[in-house]
């Protein structure tokens, strides 16, 4: 009888440590994404980007999916939400036709089921990039904490997309579930 | 019968509590690291930043270590990192050596095992701080999600360390494990 | 027997589940609280923000309190906290008084057993808002991993209240907790 | 309809100086860069300058650095090319042309002035 | 600064007959930042084609621009009489802004 339950108990222990193994990875979806530099739209409005990487690089991707330049959420919950946005100018890369710019970053949540688009985040600066400097550069960070619901895509939204900078450390988006909904 | 049953039973909650109190503890590892600023090397140039508290006022670690300027990772997994970094400049320092500065911040990883070292995240702006202005200050935030291995090392590097602003609150950096690999 | 002790596994399995649910909710508090720009202070010195949504739009808070404009920490952890805060002008709000600006953040921790504030993180940039140009934007975000004991207060102070941006995607703050104390 | 009018062409002996000027109209002049283009007798084109829409930015070709400055007077919706220490190699027709405003680095060139010639010869 | 290369010089093509210039870079022009333009004898040039593919205003279909990198093609379908002129390249992805030499298409 002993024998048996101490059997038991290992079952209880082993498919405890299974579970809660199993149930905690499944309950920690992420994404880091990076830009894709060689499908950077030009002008300077605000645009929609749609070109990153998601398996190179820093870049990596579990249990979201990236899908038509969105982050689309695949399990309810409250994420940590960031974005890194470095524009940068050179005197070689062209000459700037004005020296006054608007920087930005929108980070937007779309709901499918509700068609909706909402900015969840925003940041940036107007900023004075004078001819007389041969090289300008300038970032936005931007995070916050947000309740996120199966279905629904993350997309960034910026100003000047010509200006942004292409490396996989200046350029990126991401997220991290941190609990469920009660 | 029974009694040896619940005996069990309590072994098994008790263990249980006591495994997922220390699984959970010793899964997420951290680091808030604040500038020490009896060290801060001088020039322009970009340098690597050694000096930082780790059990003083803000700054705390556990199971992290901090040797030779850098966060040393001792456990596999997914973390965020962050760093900010504030400049300032008042003229009651001297005068500015250039109003044309660069200022920037770099977080670096390196692999011991693979003796290499990569930019994970970088932030920053040129600015022009005028003499026309007795006081200047600009702050830089990073953060992003990233796979860490035992072994792999953290470090910043900035531009103009001379700017710096010593305090805790301004320039620090951090880390915590949010989960592991699969 | 055998029967029993399965019931007994069961209640086991069951009586974890709960706990381990409720445990990891409980063990997670969080807020996101964005500006509530009906009681925004006027001036340009530094001032405590103490209107701020919990509870419409992107604005949530769970076990923690938000009370007399402070974010009330209801149970000790290790806690990443953040803030974005948005400043802007526009021609059409009339002249600024100075064209050189200080816009800062401070994010303060108060304890009311040891009756005393600290400030944690700060961030933001001095700037020439010429008028020349007739919008101005800049934003700033901080954030950092702080331990925080049951009864600690966190609040917001700003320079230049008077030209916060009021949208809740551009000036709000926020925490959630990561971690235990060991 | 956006139009550009050129002036200010003429015969100038080696060393000597011109100004050229253009005349815009019929867009919000001061919201867009503008350049000067040249086309040697029988040649080819080649950017000599541009300024942003505010005025603030300047930029020239190598050839003609230090020699030319490029100005404009929003007020007066007129773009101006003042050229001294002229060569027998800047002999060419100057045309004004409008940046499109579209991106923020200066881009392609449309419309385009009709174009003035100077001749600079003993 | 990057060196735009035209070829052919001249082209001799009768109306109705499609024409292919090509216009070559010294280095790849980010963007693709390329525009066309066609000049008639005693006129100022006139846009065609800009980001290597995209019509300007007015600009008939049978005008058609592609390419990226090093190497960016004018096709014009079907050569209407007043087709004929001096076609222009012209790089904007790098500083100086700078043309090709010129493809002259001319009547056969």
């Known amino acids: 009888g002993s024998q048996h339950i101490r059997a038991e108990k290992a079952m209880v222990d082993g498919s405890w440590l299974d579970l809660a193994k199993r149930s905690k990875l499944e309950a920690q979806p992420f994404a880091h994404l990076t830009i894709n530099a060689t499908d950077i739209p030009s002008g300077s409005h605000k645009v929609s980007l749609s070109s990153w990487y998601h398996d190179r690089g820093w870049a990596k991707i579990s249990n979201m999916t990236f899908s038509n330049g969105k982050l689309i959420v695949n399990q309810d919950g409250f994420y940590y939400l960031y974005a890194n946005i470095c524009f940068r100018h050179h005197e070689t890369s062209g000459d700037l036709a004005t020296e006054y710019l608007q920087l930005m970053v929108y980070v937007t949540k779309t709901s499918i089921k509700i068609p909706s688009s909402h900015t969840l985040m925003k940041g940036g600066s107007t900023k004075y990039w004078s001819g007389n400097s041969e090289f300008h550069f300038y970032s936005i960070n931007v995070g916050g904490f947000f309740k996120l619901r199966s279905g629904e895509e993350i997309s960034i939204e910026v100003s000047n997309p010509s200006l942004l900078d292409p490396d996989q450390d200046a350029t990126y988006f991401g997220a991290f579930k941190v609990r469920d909904i009660d | 019968g029974s009694q040896h049953i619940r005996a069990e039973k309590a072994m098994v909650d008790g263990s249980w509590l006591d495994l997922a109190k220390r699984s959970k503890l010793e899964a997420q590892p951290f680091a808030h690291l604040t500038i020490n600023a009896t060290d801060i090397p001088s020039g322009s140039h970009k340098v690597s930043l050694s000096s930082w508290y780790h059990d003083r006022g803000w700054a705390k670690i556990s199971n992290m270590t901090f040797s030779n300027g850098k966060l040393i990772v001792n456990q596999d997994g997914f973390y965020y990192l962050y760093a900010n970094i504030c400049f300032r400049h008042h003229e009651t320092s001297g005068d500015l050596a250039t109003e044309y500065l660069q200022l920037m911040v770099y977080v670096t990883k390196t692999s011991i095992k693979i003796p290499s070292s990569h930019t994970l995240m970088k932030g920053g702006s040129t600015k022009y701080w005028s003499g026309n202005s007795e006081f200047h200050f600009y702050s830089i935030n990073v953060g992003g999600f990233f796979k860490l291995r035992s072994g792999e090392e953290i470090s910043i590097e900035v531009s103009n360390p001379s700017l710096l602003d010593p305090d805790q609150d301004a320039t620090y950096f951090g880390a915590f494990k949010v989960r592991d690999i699969d | 027997g055998s029967q029993h002790i399965r019931a007994e596994k069961a209640m086991v399995d069951g009586s974890w589940l709960d706990l381990a649910k409720r445990s990891k909710l409980e063990a997670q508090p969080f807020a996101h609280l964005t500006i509530n720009a009906t009681d925004i202070p006027s001036g340009s010195h530094k001032v405590s923000l103490s209107s701020w949504y919990h509870d419409r739009g992107w604005a949530k808070i769970s076990n923690m309190t938000f009370s007399n404009g402070k974010l009330i920490v209801n149970q000790d952890g290790f806690y990443y906290l953040y803030a974005n805060i948005c400043f802007r002008h526009h021609e059409t709000s009339g002249d600024l008084a100075t064209e050189y600006l200080q816009l800062m953040v401070y994010v303060t921790k108060t304890s009311i057993k040891i009756p005393s504030s600290h400030t944690l993180m700060k961030g933001g940039s001095t700037k020439y808002w010429s008028g020349n140009s007739e919008f101005h934007f800049y934003s700033i975000n901080v954030g950092g991993f702080f331990k925080l004991r049951s009864g600690e207060e966190i609040s917001i102070e700003v320079s230049n209240p008077s030209l916060l941006d009021p949208d809740q995607d551009a000036t709000y703050f926020g925490a959630f907790k990561v971690r235990d104390i060991d | 309809e956006v139009q550009l009018l050129e002036s200010g062409g003429g015969l100038v002996q080696p060393g000597g100086s011109l100004r050229l000027s253009c005349a815009a109209s019929?867009?919000?002049?001061?919201?867009?860069?503008m350049s000067w283009v040249r086309q040697a007798p029988g040649k080819g084109l080649e950017w000599v300058s541009g300024?942003?829409?505010?005025?603030?930015?300047?930029y020239y070709a190598d050839s003609v650095k230090g020699r030319f400055t490029i100005s404009r007077d929003n007020s007066k919706n007129t773009l101006y090319l003042q050229m001294n220490s002229l060569r027998a190699e800047d002999t060419a027709v100057y045309y004004c042309?409008?940046?499109?405003?579209?991106?923020?680095?200066?881009?392609?060139?449309?419309?385009w002035g009709q174009g003035t010639l100077v001749t600079v010869s003993s | 600064e990057i060196v735009l290369t035209q070829s052919p010089g001249t082209l001799s093509l009768s109306p109705g007959e499609r024409a292919t210039l090509s216009c070559r870079a010294s280095?790849?022009?980010?963007?693709?930042?390329l525009a066309w333009y066609q000049q008639k004898p005693g006129q100022a040039p006139r846009l065609l084609i800009y980001?290597?593919?995209s019509r300007a205003t007015g600009i008939p279909d049978r005008f058609s621009g592609s390419g990226s990198g090093t190497d960016f093609t004018l096709t014009i379908s079907r050569l209407e009489p007043e087709d004929f002129a001096v076609f222009y390249c012209?790089?904007?992805?790098?500083?100086?802004?700078?043309f090709g030499q010129g493809t002259k298409v001319e009547i056969k």
């Open positions: 042309a409008k940046d499109p405003g579209t991106t923020v680095i200066m881009s392609w060139f449309d419309p």
């Open positions: 019929g867009f919000t002049f001061s919201s867009y860069a």
């Open positions: 300024i942003t829409g505010s005025g603030g930015s300047t």
């Open positions: 280095q790849s022009i980010p963007g693709p930042r």
């Open positions: 980001g290597a593919s």
């Open positions: 012209q790089q904007y992805g790098s500083s100086p802004r700078t």
